[in-house]
Amino acid sequence: LPAQVAFTPYAPEPGSTCRLREYYDQTAQMCCSKCSPGQHAKVFCTKTSDTVCDSCEDSTYTQLWNWVPECLSCGSRCSSDQVETQACTREQNRICTCRPGWYCALSKQEGCRLCAPLRKCRPGFGVARPGTETSDVVCKPCAPGTFSNTTSSTDICRPHQICNVVAIPGNASMDAVCTSTSPTRSMAPGAVHLPQPVSTRSQHTQPTPEPSTAPSTSFLLPMGPSPPAEGSTGD
């Protein structure tokens, strides 16, 4: 004969545990029903009566099967530098994430506690590591033969155009100026932008005669977040 199915509340067999979506009530010493997400325990179980559940009130929630006496409060409304990516419901907390052009400088269990604007690389510096939702932009000096003339959290250093006849040589913050009307560009026209969010970091040039000149040498790869420094500007 199949074993009888026990209905809550019931006393568990010695050494056994309660089933899924049940909990052991120490006072009643019985296995009792949990409340479903969106509910909480209004009345705890006894030896003869099961848990009584009730719906969460407005601005409160429970995300899991539970036996908590009160639902959890939803987080405060999203700040102006955030967007609400998940609304507060009876079954889930509000989630705030940083709006485009910002990154999460201080995260919490879900969403973001503190957003900060993505660092902007100043002229002579380019984005060396795009920002992400959780990391700032990294800026680095433009390598010889490249330039950036913008203050931007998305622009990378770009190669100087190749002139038939150079009027003004390019440097780290300025493209070359050609005297002929049809320069040979080493790249396609138009600025190269990285998608938002982007991340840059501090940049240090070695000593050079002019602040605008390119650092003596180097090629780079992206890296993690860092505080603002030479070559970057805050918002």
């Epitope: 984005v127 590591r129 390598a143 090629f219």
Partner: antibody
């Protein structure tokens, strides 16, 4: 003149650890990321990871992140790549580089051959 | 994990011909998400970065090399092959916090 000079060839046993150095000159090491790339015999390139010598921040390829440590010593202008728990498939040439898809500063070390054999 | 697929694996052409090498991203459009780059490797020589930002030639790279991107694909075109262009070409795509190289295309003389 820009140069990246790597340490010599290594022969290691499976399970061992190897540490390769990359001494840079001709530029300020803090201005650029140093990358490490693997090329196994007859195979293509695999990006291992990079270090930002300015602050020591690192990022690693998912395939390597559990076994690799990349560091940089700005006082000696040297970057290091340490690979642990070596196995036969780690037999390869390892290159350090300033190559970076966000810049146009393109210099590579001469490569270090690592042979893993019992 | 992201996969970068290059095609063809081998391309046999003659000097003067046009070469088209393709690179496909397993996730997302290369023009916005992956910041496509192309690197050249010749036997016994150092690697050389050719293209950055999907379509920017690196300083000193001849005008016959050009890059373009559309959707999940990025392409390296060599308009008129010179003898020194026969080599292995790798594309590299950026995935949030790491680079991924394609398997390479060997460009050989027909």
């Amino acid at each position: 003149e820009v140069q990246l000079v790597q340490s010599g060839a290594e022969v290691k046993k499976p399970g061992a650890t190897v540490k390769i150095s990359c001494k840079v000159s001709g530029f300020n090491i803090k201005d650029f990321y140093i990358h490490w790339v693997q090329q196994a015999p007859g195979k293509g390139l695999e990006w291992i990871g990079r270090v930002d010598p300015e602050d020591g921040n690192t990022e690693y390829a998912p395939n390597f992140q559990d076994r690799v440590t990349i560091t940089a010593d700005t006082s000696t202008d040297t970057a290091y790549m340490e690979l642990s728990s070596l196995r036969s498939e780690d037999t390869a040439v390892y290159y350090c580089s300033t190559w970076d898809g966000f810049s146009y500063f393109d210099y590579w070390g001469q490569g270090t051959t690592v042979t893993v054999s019992s | 994990e992201a996969v970068v697929t290059q095609s063809p694996a081998t391309l046999s052409l003659s000097p003067g011909e046009r070469a088209t090498l393709s690179c496909r991203s397993s996730t997302g459009p290369v023009t916005t998400n992956n910041y496509a780059n192309w690197v050249q490797q010749k036997p016994g020589q150092a690697f050389r970065g050719l293209i950055g930002g999907t379509n920017d030639r690196a300083p000193g790279i001849p005008a016959r090399f050009s890059g373009s991107g559309s959707g999940t694909d990025t392409t390296l075109t060599i308009s008129s092959l010179q003898p020194e262009d026969f080599a292995v070409y790798y594309c590299a795509l950026w995935y949030r916090n790491h680079w991924v190289f394609g398997g390479g295309t060997k460009l050989e003389i027909k």
